[in-house]
Interface confidence: low
């Protein structure tokens, strides 16, 4: 016989989730096992299976597991079949769904003080208890005129009245959990004694001295009333007219009409509804005063053939925003085609040279048009009207190298010299047309040259070579007047440069010819011991063949040069005392001597009482103050040379005498006492 | 939050001139019309005008029209008033007022000595 | 311009006190009339706009009536901090103008 140990047995189940119903049998033979459920045979599925005899539910249904359930155990050999008790689950649930109305039968039935009622669909088991929101607030029993039953998913409102306008919602809990409405209910029930919105104010933009107006009206019953207030205060009624607002009219309807409008009737206007009951109703229109400004000026556009270019209109500033075209030859632009308008934008596709020219953007609105014009030139490459010339250039003299070009827009021309570019300074000079000037040409200038010719749309270049020919000049050019040293050897040289190297003599300007001990060697005139008669004016002739000769006169002067006879020695002098230094000087000319104090030189016109310079030179100071102290230097100097010798002055405070001096004592340092 | 704040107490001489300045925070600036209004020590409270600083319009009480010049800064939202041809009786704390009067500014004293 | 005239100039009462402060305008001027309250030494501070409008932050033992020409402003149990002088002033019509004002002082 087939015995059951363990049989299934009802139990409480949680939608959703685990369960077990057990089955274990004990046969002599070979039994198999399956279930029934409400006399069906059940399949095993992912959700419900068997497991050994017990049959396993990974989550209940409460559809598909409500019923019966049975555990058959059968001997397939003997055919003998045994059945265990039924078994059922108990499942507790809970599903959201929608707040409805359940009366009257439609929304537009819904009318004030009339009964309203409201369904909840939340369902469950066991069934739940109901809770009710209006605008999220819990309602309570009683509460407000309406009665609710929390046990019931009913809520009834009677009368309904504009009080209960809100958003209905509800929620509801049981065993199983809690859960609240899917979808919410808008009640809204209109007080006719509330201002309701029939037209609203709309935002205009007027152009100044136009008119402007707007249309506002309310309905309530009793009817609303209706007020206008300007900016954020003051009220326009045609009895009281703010004084900027004096052209302004209110009609019956609720209308506001403003005429000639000036920039100070802009801005918000508002319209103030007010029922008998209720909020007042508030609507805002602005009045904006039509603008426009000016547009940005446009740089003018170079563009190379072939290319595609844009160019953007900026639209002006504007109220209301302008509407922007593009005209060329006073034609308006097409959207499309090779040269046309894409938005704001100016698009010239594959430029030719025949688009070169005035294009035009346009901004217009009420309050005017603006327009601004952009030229347009289609860049070509140069061509050559004159290139450079391989040149030969004097020294001296200014030269010029040709670089004449022509394109749109005009070339731009830059020169090389050497590979270096040419910066223009005090020697060079590009003029317009692209010629290169070189003032005073010098030797070093014989290089290449190259110039750069250019447009956006390419480049041209060519070069020359400039040969410089060299003037006949002296090199250095001699002193114009030269001291020798009377009794002492003496050269003068003089040396010159040409396009051929030239010869160069010595002859005294009188045409005398020179003294034996004066030799002329190579352009350097030798004095071997000199006399006073060597003293004169002399004359350099340098010359060659192509270039002729030229000439430099030199006054040579015989001198004895300065020594000193006496110089200043270091001197120490007490304070309020005269301070001595002795200078004198010899050679001729006779030299004349200078002082130097303090590194300044002391202009004997300038000295003041205190100071005095002797005709033998020397320089007394006065009342000698410690800002006297310093470096003084005898300066000796004639038309032929300068010497200068230098000494330090001390200025001490005299010291107070002690008790084993008398009064002879010497000082301890060498004085000047006067 | 929304606040005005005025300048600094002024001590001026018989026949100059002042600026007061009041400077708006917390609020769109342009949405709201500034009121100026004088309290003489230990009296009421007298209107001098309004400016719309959106527009830059004014409006003056008649016994102030020679006496105060109302100008505003947008983009600083600052709100001016110049007294000119001072005398004596200009002595008083002035305030400046949002629309509504909802809102006051801190008041400046202005004080007219030889 | 519109005359605003208000009574009495002052006022003593009592704390827990109700209290009454008058405002006549010498022309209609609809709704449009606000309450102020000045404290010693302080800026002026509204109370009430329109009329009744509570402004804000105002306790509610102050409350406004009236309309057209004649107004009140009513203080239900005075509490110290109600010290002040009170003004009222119209919008109806510039140039905007106040009450002389009316000082409350505690018994």
């Known amino acids: 016989a087939i015995v059951f140990i363990k049989q299934p047995s009802s139990q409480d189940a949680l939608q959703g989730r685990r369960a077990l119903l057990r089955c274990e049998v004990e046969a002599p033979g070979l039994v198999h096992v399956y279930w029934l459920l409400d006399g069906a045979p059940v399949q095993d599925t992912e959700r419900r299976f068997t497991q050994g005899s017990s049959l396993s539910f990974a989550a209940v249904d409460r559809l598909q597991d409500s019923g019966t359930f049975q555990c058959v155990a059968r001997d397939d050999v003997t055919g003998e079949e045994a059945r265990s008790a039924n078994a059922s689950f108990n499942i507790k649930w809970i599903e959201a769904g929608p707040v409805v109305l359940k009366h009257p039968a439609s929304e537009a039935e819904i009318q004030p003080q009339t009964q309203v009622t409201l369904r909840c669909h939340i369902d469950g088991h066991p069934r739940p208890t109901y809770q009710w929101f209006r605008d999220g607030t819990p309602l309570s029993d009683g509460q407000s005129n309406n009665t609710v039953s929390s046990k019931e998913r009913n809520l009834t409102l009677r009368p309904a009245g504009p009080e209960h306008s809100g958003l209905y919602s509800c929620c509801a809990h049981n065993a199983f959990g809690q859960a609240c409405s899917s979808q919410n209910f808008t009640l809204s029930i209109a007080d006719e004694s509330f201002a309701r919105v029939v037209l609203a104010p709309q935002d205009v933009i007027v152009a100044r001295n136009e008119e402007a107006m707007f249309h506002c009206q309310f309905s309530a019953q009793p009817p609303p009333n209706l007020q206008w207030l300007f900016e954020d205060e003051t009220p326009i009624t045609n009895r009281s007219r703010p004084p900027h607002l004096r052209r302004a009219t209110v009609f019956a309807n609720g209308s506001l009409l403003l005429t000639q409008v000036r920039p100070r009737n802009a801005g918000v206007y508002r319209c103030i509804g007010q029922g008998q009951r209720g909020p007042p109703v508030i609507l805002e229109a602005t009045l904006h005063l039509a603008e426009i400004e000016d547009m940005p000026l446009f740089e003018p556009r170079v563009f190379t053939a072939g290319s595609e270019e844009r160019v953007t209109c900026l639209p002006p500033k504007g109220l209301p925003e302008p509407s922007v075209w593009w005209e060329h030859a006073g034609v308006r632009l097409p959207t499309h085609g090779r040269v046309y308008q894409k938005g704001h934008e100016l698009v010239l596709a594959s430029i030719a040279e025949s688009d070169a020219g005035v294009y035009t953007c346009h901004a217009a609105n009420l309050a005017g048009q603006r327009r601004q014009d952009v030229n347009i030139t289609v860049a070509t490459v140069p061509t050559w009207l004159k290139k450079p010339q391989d040149s030969q250039l004097e020294e001296g003299k200014p030269g010029y190298l040709h670089c004449l070009t022509q394109a749109t827009p005009k070339p731009t021309v830059v020169w090389y010299r050497n590979q270096m570019l040419i910066s223009e300074d005090s020697r060079f000079e590009v003029f317009k047309n692209g010629t290169l000037r070189i003032n005073n040409v010098e030797v070093y200038d014989g290089t290449w040259y190259r110039c750069v010719s250019s447009t956006p749309a390419g480049s041209i270049e060519a070069q020359a070579r400039v040969q410089v020919l060299e003037k006949l000049k002296f090199t250095p050019p001699p002193q114009p007047q030269q001291c020798m040293e009377f009794d002492k050897e003496a050269t003068v040289p003089c040396s010159a440069t040409g396009r051929e190297k030239p010869t160069i003599k010595w002859e005294r300007a009188d045409g005398s010819s020179l003294p034996e001990w004066v030799t002329d060697n190579a352009g350097t005139l030798h004095f071997a011991r000199v006399t006073r008669d060597d003293a004169g004016n002399y004359t350099c002739i340098a010359s060659n063949g192509p270039q002729g000769q030229i000439r430099a006169h030199v006054q040579l002067t015989v001198a004895v040069f300065i020594t000193f006879k006496v110089e200043p020695e270091r001197t120490t002098v007490y304070q309020g005392h005269t301070a001595l230094l002795q200078c004198e000087a010899q050679g001729d000319p006779k030299p004349l001597i200078q002082w130097k104090g303090k590194d300044r030189i002391l202009d004997p016109t300038k000295l003041g009482p205190r100071m005095h310079i002797f005709q033998n030179g020397s320089l007394v100071i006065h009342d000698v103050a410690p800002e006297d102290s310093g470096r003084y230097t005898c300066i000796a100097g004639n038309s032929c040379n300068i010497k200068h010798t230098e000494a330090p002055l001390y200025v001490v405070d005299k010291p107070v005498p002690e008790e084993s001096e008398g009064p002879g004592s010497p000082p301890p340092y060498k004085m000047i006492q006067t | 939050q929304v606040q005005l704040q005025q300048s600094g107490a002024e001590l001026a001489k018989p026949g100059a001139s002042v600026r007061l300045s009041c400077k708006a925070s917390?609020?769109?600036?342009?949405?709201?019309?500034m009121h100026w209004l004088k309290q003489r020590p230990g009296q009421g409270l007298e209107w001098i005008g309004y400016i719309n600083p959106s527009s830059g319009y004014t409006e003056y009480n008649q016994n102030f029209k020679d006496k105060a010049t109302l100008t505003a800064d947008k983009s600083s939202s600052t709100a001016y008033m110049q007294l000119s041809s001072l005398t004596y009786e200009d002595s008083a704390v002035y305030y400046c007022?949002?629309?509504?009067?909802?809102?006051w500014g801190t008041g400046t004293t202005v004080t007219v000595s030889s | 311009d519109i005359v605003m005239t208000q009574s009495p100039s002052s006022l003593s009462a009592s704390l827990g006190d109700t209290i009454t402060i008058t405002c006549h305008a010498s022309?209609?001027?609809?709704?449009?009339l606000s309450w102020y309250q000045q404290k010693p030494g302080n800026i002026p501070k509204l109370l009430i706009s329109k009329a009744s409008n509570l402004h804000t932050g105002v306790p509610s033992r102050f409350s406004g009536s009236g309309s057209g020409s004649g107004f009140t402003l009513t203080i239900s149990s005075l509490q110290p901090e109600d010290i002040a002088t009170y003004y009222c002033q119209q919008g109806q019509s510039y140039p905007f103008t106040f009450g002389s004002g009316t000082k409350l002082e505690i018994k």
């Open positions: 022309q209609n001027i609809n709704l449009w």
């Open positions: 007022a949002r629309s509504y009067f909802d809102v």
């Open positions: 917390g609020y769109t600036f342009t949405r709201y019309w």
